[in-house]
């Protein structure tokens, strides 16, 4: 039961953190005008990855796309590039997710099998979580820089009459939204591994038994099911102990009361 | 077709309050950002109020800060502006006028006039 | 607050004739986020109220007669009458619409001969 909620809820979780980052991804305020010198403001400027926006206050606003790739700073590409890898990751640890749930029956499909995929949906969410808060963390250090950089200038070269007005950016909504989203993919992505521990056909614990056979002693060791060798394929492996362990036959013949059809 | 028709002004006297409206027509007042401008007798043009679309924002010039209150009744769609503690340096035409385009006014209506006077 | 500043204050021409005013603003009226200059040129015949001719420095409105061209960035801007009429007699106004106070400058008054 706990291993089906873990389970749900990773992917719950890392639902929303995509969802999240394609959100942040396509918003168009990673930075915005700084206000603090000036708060009444009537002209209102805004970027994104994809387009700047400049909102006027007679509620006009206009967005202009960036219709150039080599034009643009290598930074803004890198962050472009990371958003959009996160989004694919996640995009694919979902589809991956979904047949992995364990309330989800496809088939005869296997635990290990549930168990390989909630492990790679998991490491996938992970890695798109670090995609976007990367990305994100890469855009605000640049903000921060640029940001510390434009100050500078605003104090230099005032001596003559005339003043230019130095537009500074700071954080925007997406960037928030951003680190919140990878966030919670990567704390999605974490559960799923964690579930996957649950989910695997764990080793199932045998007393060590001595068989006597034809004057040779063989030592059984525990988890030697598995791999069944030495077994005619008639033989039933019989419960040496009643401890909760099922023989293979009874794992296969009953199902849990977890799984929903 | 846009209308804009300023009523309310009159002869006050120094101190006095006064309350100007704007009656809208030909579009939905809520959906613009409206101001109001003045015109002193010496000809100056000086912006005095504006009130940003869905009213949450209204701006002021520090001449008339804490004196004069900008505000819109959608229902009515009219403007209004409350002048208050009115000195003889308020004396002007008084015109409402809604914003386009790049903050220009595109559209005033034809201004009511307002004498602060002993 | 961005002071706003005229020439000349009147100018009296001849019909036909190019006319130029020039309006200096204190402060830098471009935006960088649009690349667009924030500055708005009007026209006030008199008893009228008055009448909106160009913003974005070079953007004509509406309306307005192609003879009218404004241009100019950054701090220096001039509105252009290319060949001035008769129905021109007016005052000329700019107005800074890039930072609150939004302020105005003293007016060109175009007379005609």
């Known amino acids: 039961m706990a291993v089906t909620a873990c389970q749900g809820l990773g992917f719950v979780v890392s639902l929303i953190g995509i969802a999240g980052i394609i959100a942040a991804t396509c918003m168009d305020q990673w930075s915005t005008q700084d206000l603090y010198n000036n708060p009444v403001t009537a002209v209102f400027n805004y970027q994104g990855l994809w387009r700047s926006c400049v909102r006027e206050s007679s509620g006009f606003t206009e967005c202009r796309g960036y219709f150039t790739l080599l034009g643009l700073p290598a930074m803004l590409q890198a962050v472009r590039a990371l958003m959009i890898v996160g989004i694919v990751l996640g995009a694919i640890g979902l589809l991956v997710s979904i047949f992995a749930l364990k309330c989800i029956r496809i088939g005869s499909m296997e635990d290990s099998a549930k168990a390989n995929m909630t492990l790679t949906s998991g490491i996938m969410f992970i890695v798109s979580g670090l995609c976007a808060i990367a990305g994100v963390s890469v855009f605000a250090n640049m903000l921060v820089t640029n940001f510390w950089m434009s100050t500078a200038n605003m104090y230099t070269g005032m001596g003559g009459m005339v003043q230019t007005v130095q537009t500074r950016y700071t954080f925007g909504a997406a960037l928030f939204v951003g680190w919140v989203a990878g966030g919670l993919t990567l704390i999605g992505g974490v559960m799923m591994c964690i579930a996957c521990r649950g989910l695997a056909p764990e080793e199932t614990n045998y007393k060590a038994v001595s068989y006597h056979a034809s004057g040779h002693s063989v030592a059984y060791k525990p988890g030697g099911f598995k791999a069944s060798t030495g077994f005619g394929s008639n033989t039933k492996n019989k419960k040496i102990y009643d401890g909760g362990a099922r023989t293979e036959d009874e794992v296969q013949s009953y199902p849990s009361k977890h799984d929903y059809v | 077709e846009v209308m804009l028709v300023e009523s309310g002004g009159g002869i006050v006297k120094p101190g006095g309050s006064l309350k100007l409206s704007c009656a809208a027509s030909?579009?939905?007042?809520?959906?613009?950002?409206m101001s109001w401008v003045r015109q002193t007798p010496e000809r100056r043009l000086e912006w005095v109020a504006t009130?940003?679309?869905?009213?949450?924002?209204?701006y002021y010039p520090d001449s008339v800060k804490g004196r004069f209150t900008i505000s819109r009744d959608n229902a009515k769609n009219t403007l209004y502006l409350q002048m208050s503690s009115l000195r003889s340096e308020d004396t002007a035409m008084y015109y409402c006028a809604r914003q386009g385009y790049g903050n220009s006014f595109p559209y005033w209506g034809q201004g009511t006039l307002v004498t602060v006077s002993a | 607050d961005i002071v706003m500043t005229q020439s000349p204050s009147s100018l009296t021409v001849t019909a036909g004739e190019k006319v130029t005013m020039s309006c200096k603003s204190s402060?830098?009226?471009?935006?960088?986020?649009?690349?667009?200059?924030?500055l708005t040129w009007y026209q006030q015949k008199p008893g009228q109220p008055p009448k909106l001719l160009i913003y974005?420095?070079?953007t004509r409105e509406s309306g307005v007669p192609d003879r009218f061209t404004g241009s100019g960035s950054g701090t220096d801007f001039t509105l252009t009458i290319s060949s001035v009429q008769a129905e021109d007699l007016a005052v000329y106004y700019c107005?800074?619409?890039?930072?609150?106070?939004?302020?105005f400058g003293s007016g060109t008054k175009l007379e005609i001969k």
């Open positions: 009130i940003i679309i869905g009213g949450s924002y209204t």
């Open positions: 107005q800074n619409d890039y930072s609150y106070p939004f302020t």
């Open positions: 402060q830098s009226l471009l935006n960088s986020g649009n690349q667009k200059n924030y």
């Open positions: 030909g579009f939905t007042l809520s959906s613009y950002t």
């Open positions: 974005w420095a070079s």
